[in-house]
């Protein structure tokens, strides 16, 4: 039975040209996290595997940095980065948990950054 829940940074906004941290946290389960995938729509951004470490997709290498923790930092944001982002936790024995974050990249300087937190 899957008892875990994923907390995310929810809906966030950021300025064009800036950077933002996408963060998820899996709680309420003792399942072992074997891998976390970060995806934008159906496109793979990055993988963090407990054994193999980080892999950033080649097409995002210049603008995506691993961390902090199992999170992902997006840099040099453009309005095209607006959209849904998913953290997909692969766990044993529970299976897969998915969290959703909506990022809006704004042209103006009035962007309000959503709450951020780090995994200790």
């Amino acid at each position: 039975m899957m008892t875990g829940t994923i907390e995310t940074t929810g809906n966030i906004s950021a300025e064009k040209g800036g950077s933002i941290i996408l963060q998820c946290h899996l709680s309420s389960t003792t399942a072992q996290v074997t891998q976390v995938n970060w995806e934008q729509q159906d496109q793979l951004l990055a993988i963090c595997n407990a054994d193999l470490g980080w892999h950033i997709s080649p097409s995002f290498k210049d603008r995506v940095a691993p961390g902090p923790g199992l999170g992902l930092t997006l840099q040099s944001l453009t309005v095209n980065d607006t959209g849904e982002y998913f953290c997909i936790y692969h766990t044993y024995p529970d299976g897969t948990y998915t969290g959703r974050i909506f990022l809006e990249v704004l042209e103006s300087s009035v962007a309000e950054h959503g709450a951020r937190f780090q995994i200790p």
């Epitope: 407990a50 054994d51 193999l52 470490g53 892999h55 044993y92």
Partner: antibody, heavy 118, light 110 residues
Framework: EVQLLESGGGLVQPGGSLRLSCAAS????????MSWVRQAPGKGLEWVST??????????YYADSVKGRFSISRDNSENTLYLQMNGLRAEDTAVYYC?????????WGQGTTVTVSS | QSVLTQPPSASGTPGQRVTISCSGS????????LYWYQQLPGTAPKLLIY???QRPSGVPDRFSTSKSGTSASLAISGLQSEDEADYYC???????????FGGGTKLTVL
């Protein structure tokens, strides 16, 4: 150019020891996952051992068939990967390749031959 | 014995499309990324496909993959004589903490 060059293979008696070396050029071994993979004569590929990049937990992993007998290590100043092989058995006879990479091994050496026979 | 099962041999004529299968348990294939290696006669293996479907630079798009349920396959279209080689599928097993290779498939270009 990114290259790997293995050495240290040879003929050894059962129960004996060998140390294989893998000299890297064009990249720094401590920054990457490094593995040893072997291939017995006329057979397929068999994973032997992997060491993680020093930036990621610094783990080492071994196949059950070599656990307790083989040890993977690296010398960062020499930019070289090693495989210390003790208690060698006839079934360890193979070409031993070192390889670089975590999400797929994208650079391989040419291999060094280890023969275990009395 | 390998956790990943491949046919020992496959063949085709120049220009043809050939496929090489790789099968395993649902856990192995379905929830893990698959990798493919090519080993030309007398040479070291070469990474052909990583993360299920990604080709390293220099690998032609004649090589493609698919994955469904408990099996996966490597397809080679427009077969060429230089494609004659051994092909291996592989995956990283998070529970064994190690790489698992298929037994390999010897591809002959007739």
């Amino acid at each position: 150019e990114v290259q790997l060059l293995e050495s240290g293979g040879g003929l050894v008696q059962p129960g004996g020891s060998l140390r294989l070396s893998c000299a890297a050029s064009g990249f720094t071994v401590s920054d990457h996952y490094m593995s040893w993979v072997r291939q017995a004569p006329g057979k397929g590929l068999e994973w032997v051992s992997t060491t993680s990049s020093t930036s990621w937990k610094n783990y080492t992993y071994y196949a059950d068939s070599v656990k307790g007998r083989f040890s993977i290590s690296r010398d960062n100043s020499e930019n070289t990967l090693y495989l210390q092989m003790n208690g060698l058995r006839a079934e360890d006879t193979a070409v031993y390749y070192c390889a670089k990479g975590s999400y797929g091994m994208d650079v391989w050496g040419q291999g060094t031959t280890v023969t275990v026979s009395s | 014995q390998s956790v990943l099962t491949q046919p020992p041999s496959a063949s085709g004529t120049p220009g043809q499309r050939v496929t090489i299968s790789c099968s395993g348990s649902n856990f192995n294939i379905g929830t893990k990324y698959l990798y493919w290696y090519q080993q030309l006669p007398g040479t070291a293996p070469k990474l052909l496909i990583y993360l299920d479907s990604q080709r390293p630079s220099g690998v032609p798009d004649r090589f493609s993959t698919s994955k469904s349920g408990t099996s996966a396959s490597l397809a080679i279209s427009g077969l060429q004589s230089e494609d004659e080689a051994d092909y291996y599928c592989a995956l990283w097993d998070d529970h064994l903490h190690g790489w698992v290779f298929g037994g390999g498939t010897k591809l002959t270009v007739l």
